[in-house]
């Protein structure tokens, strides 16, 4: 079905990380636009990128209004020049995506360890509340606002002369762990929503060790 | 107010590398777009490519395909662009400018001139 | 890609004049297309997006239409300030592209 001179779009795959969503497809389009529209199961169909020649579109802007819900997208083929076209049965060729639910399935973007402190024998580390595009009255929420206690991070941390690591658990942005006296530790963490069956955890941040500029010692 | 600051002119010889960086602020720079736009001296505006940080996505114009690299580190919040192969005719000023919401470029650089010549 | 043909390429006019500027698409665009202003020099500033659009802090007297392919930027009372270059750009598609400026100058 469909006009003769185009092509339903197909793989149609959802990329999403702390929430911004773009929508990828194929084929490049040889004589053809696309235009998008997506829609929550109860909801109308949206409009988006319009009568274009790419084989993606971002639509952060519409998921972000309910992260809980969950999507449904569908791209059309339109023969170039002639977007009034139709198919045989009176509406032009589409393909519907995959659901998408972005509080379920948002990738988890890699954190950053924001500073350690050496106080004694303990060391305070605090991991960055990165900000999303999700908004409430106006502002931007953190990962922390939108998933709460659904979020923990998992410190690992081990000594600079050693390789055994250790881990720490918080569903804070903070630990408190304890460290050997005139040691000096390396950490990393990881950002993970344990009651996900998919996409569950993050890329481990970058290492950050004691000696370097993040951190801060006090002898006590 | 958002500010992209660029690294400075750059004078380089023909089929040398040039990598020029774009420092935006923290907070949502991993989610906006970052493109880079070049004008030749008396010319127009040439986009090149871009980046979306956060996804790691980044396509290019097919002009510059295989000679362009684009980077983003987010723990600096920086973008990069490297250009290879260099010719007399890559003698621009080089702009990195954030998309806005669509595909307009809301702020942008301040410029980097490069200079290619022998 | 998608080709923008601005018109004229250069024009001559006086304060208070009533400039304006076309862009032609080479495809349907729907409203997808901004203008910028840039003066020697500096980087392009904003002045309307999806084709009729006033980014904020952009003086009333600035005005843009058209939908489709056919593209118009108008500036009602031309004032000191506003002899500069103007581009269009379509943000339809990518490669995303510019029109080739149009060149505002003093009569």
């Known amino acids: 079905s469909g006009t003769t001179n185009t092509v339903a779009a197909y793989n149609l795959t959802w990329k999403s990380t702390n929430f911004k969503t773009i929508l990828e497809w194929e084929p490049k389009p040889v004589n053809q636009v696309y235009t998008v529209q997506i829609s929550t199961k109860s909801g109308d169909w949206k409009s988006k990128c319009f009568y274009t020649t790419d084989t993606e579109c971002d639509l952060t802007d519409e998921i972000v209004k309910d992260v809980k819900q969950t999507y449904l997208a569908r791209v059309f083929s339109y023969p170039a020049g002639n977007v009034e076209s139709t198919g045989s049965a009176g509406e032009p060729l589409y393909e519907n995506s995959p659901e998408f639910t972005p509080y379920l399935e948002t990738n988890l973007g890699q954190p950053t360890i924001q500073s350690f402190e050496q106080v004694g024998t303990k060391v305070n580390v605090t991991v960055e509340d990165e900000r999303t595009l999700v908004r409430r009255n106006n502002t931007f929420l953190s990962l922390r606002d939108v998933f709460g206690k659904d979020l923990i991070y998992t410190l690992y941390y081990w000594k600079s002369s050693s390789s055994g690591k250790k881990t720490a658990k918080t569903n804070t942005n903070e630990f408190l762990i304890d460290v050997d006296k005139g040691e000096n530790y390396c950490f990393s963490v990881q950002a993970v929503i344990p009651s996900r069956t998919v996409n569950r955890k993050s890329t481990d941040s970058p290492v950050e060790c004691m000696g370097q500029e993040k951190g801060e010692f006090r002898e006590i | 107010q958002v500010q992209l600051v660029q690294s400075g002119a750059e004078v380089k010889k023909p089929g040398s590398s040039v990598k020029v960086s774009c420092k935006a602020p923290?907070?949502?720079?991993?989610?906006?777009?970052i493109s880079w736009v070049r004008q030749a001296p008396g010319q127009g505006l040439e986009w090149m490519g871009r980046?979306?940080?956060?996804?790691?996505?980044?396509n290019y114009a097919q002009k510059f395909q295989g000679r362009v690299t684009i980077t983003a580190d987010k723990s600096t919040s920086t973008a990069y662009m490297e250009l290879s192969s260099l010719r007399s005719e890559d003698t621009a000023v080089y702009y990195c400018?954030?998309?806005?919401?669509?595909?307009?470029?809301?702020?942008w650089g301040q410029g980097t001139l490069v200079t290619v010549s022998s | 890609a998608i080709q923008l043909t601005q018109s004229p390429s250069s024009l001559s006019a006086s304060v208070g004049d009533r400039v304006t500027i076309t862009c032609r698409a080479s495809?349907?665009?729907?409203?997808?297309l901004a203008w910028y202003q840039q003066k020697p020099g500096k980087a392009p500033k904003l002045l309307i997006y999806?084709?009729?659009i006033l980014e904020s802090g952009v003086p009333s007297r600035f005005s843009g239409s058209g939908s489709g392919t056919d593209f118009t930027l108008t500036i009602s009372s031309l004032q000191p300030e506003d002899f500069a270059t103007y581009y269009c750009?379509?943000?339809?598609?990518?490669?995303?592209?510019f029109g080739g400026g149009t060149k505002v100058e003093i009569k």
């Open positions: 400018a954030r998309e806005g919401d669509r595909r307009y470029f809301d702020y």
């Open positions: 923290r907070g949502t720079f991993s989610y906006y777009t």
């Open positions: 980046i979306i940080p956060i996804l790691g996505v980044a």
């Open positions: 495809q349907d665009i729907s409203s997808a």
């Open positions: 999806d084709a009729s």
């Open positions: 750009q379509q943000f339809n598609s990518y490669p995303l592209t």
